[in-house]
Interface confidence: medium
């Protein structure tokens, strides 16, 4: 934990601390923006993104967005601040260690999004119902 002699003030966006005084460094996420994907009708997929980036700010989390329309399938991988909406949606699962896809209503396409807060967690995106957050074991993992 932060030693008592360390001043607890923080600079804007530079440091985030938890209740125990541990310091949050910026997270590592897959960050390929939007790429064409072959991920379809699977319980889970790897992002196939070769770029691991350190997020700009410590509060940012990893995000993945899967979209399918009549023409193609894309997968977007980025860092994003969970206090701000992404694609007009709140990142409600940002504390999850795994990227568990949730369907969002978007006209003209099938749209899934997930967010998560462990290093490179948006590399493995999970569609399977087994991981739905109605599962109490997963809730324990998320909120521990």
């Amino acid at each position: 934990t932060i030693p008592p002699h360390v001043q607890k003030s923080v600079n804007n966006d530079m440091i985030v601390t938890d209740n125990n005084g541990a310091v949050k460094f910026p997270q590592l996420c897959k960050f390929c923006d939007v790429r064409f994907s072959t991920c379809d009708n699977q319980k889970s997929c790897m992002s196939n993104c070769s770029i691991t980036s350190i997020c700009e700010k410590p509060q940012e989390v990893c995000v993945a967005v899967w979209r399918k329309n009549d023409e193609n399938i894309t997968l977007e991988t980025v860092c994003h601040d969970p206090k701000l909406p992404y694609h007009d949606f709140i990142l409600e699962d940002a504390a999850s260690p795994k990227c568990i896809m949730k369907e969002k209503k978007k006209p003209g396409e099938t749209f899934f999004m997930c967010s998560c807060s462990s290093d490179e967690c948006n590399d493995n995106i999970i569609f399977s119902e087994e991981y739905n957050t109605s599962n109490p074991d997963l809730l324990l993992v998320i909120f521990q």
Epitope: T1, A22, P58
Partner: nanobody, 120 residues
Framework: EVQLLESGGGLVQPGGSLRLSCAAS????????MGWVRQAPGKGLEWVSR????????YYTDSVKGRFTISRDNSKNTLYLQMNSLRAEDTAVYYC?????????????WGQGTLVTVSS
């Protein structure tokens, strides 16, 4: 008991170099991501750099990119920060920290710090 002991700080002129070391004990060093944090006088904390357990992936805050190099020697349980082209704004107490849990970005356990003063 986890212990982190920093050394190597001192007074250096602008443009000069220093190498900080952090001797670690009380945990499995080779399986743990490590990092450096600094605190300038009267300012808040700023993360500086982090390195993965094997030392193959390193990350830096923008203000030190191209000037600082983080490295580690797992056989000696030691973390390093090579600081080149030092500027007055690098003046701070530098702390090494260990990652709390593999895959998480929270770093707990710090050392007592080593003071770096950049002044002519």
């Amino acid at each position: 008991e986890v212990q982190l002991l920093e050394s190597g700080g001192g007074l250096v002129q602008p443009g000069g170099s220093l190498r900080l070391s952090c001797a670690a004990s009380g945990f499995t060093f080779e399986n743990t991501s490590m990092g450096w944090v600094r605190q300038a006088p009267g300012k808040g904390l700023e993360w500086v750099s982090r390195i993965d357990p094997k030392g193959s992936h390193t990350y830096y805050t923008d203000s030190v990119k191209g000037r600082f190099t983080i490295s580690r020697d797992n056989s000696k349980n030691t973390l390093y920060l090579q600081m080149n082209s030092l500027r007055a704004e690098d003046t701070a107490v530098y702390y090494c920290a260990k990652q709390r849990e593999l895959g998480k970005s929270y770093f707990d356990y710090w050392g007592q710090g080593t003071l770096v003063t950049v002044s002519s």
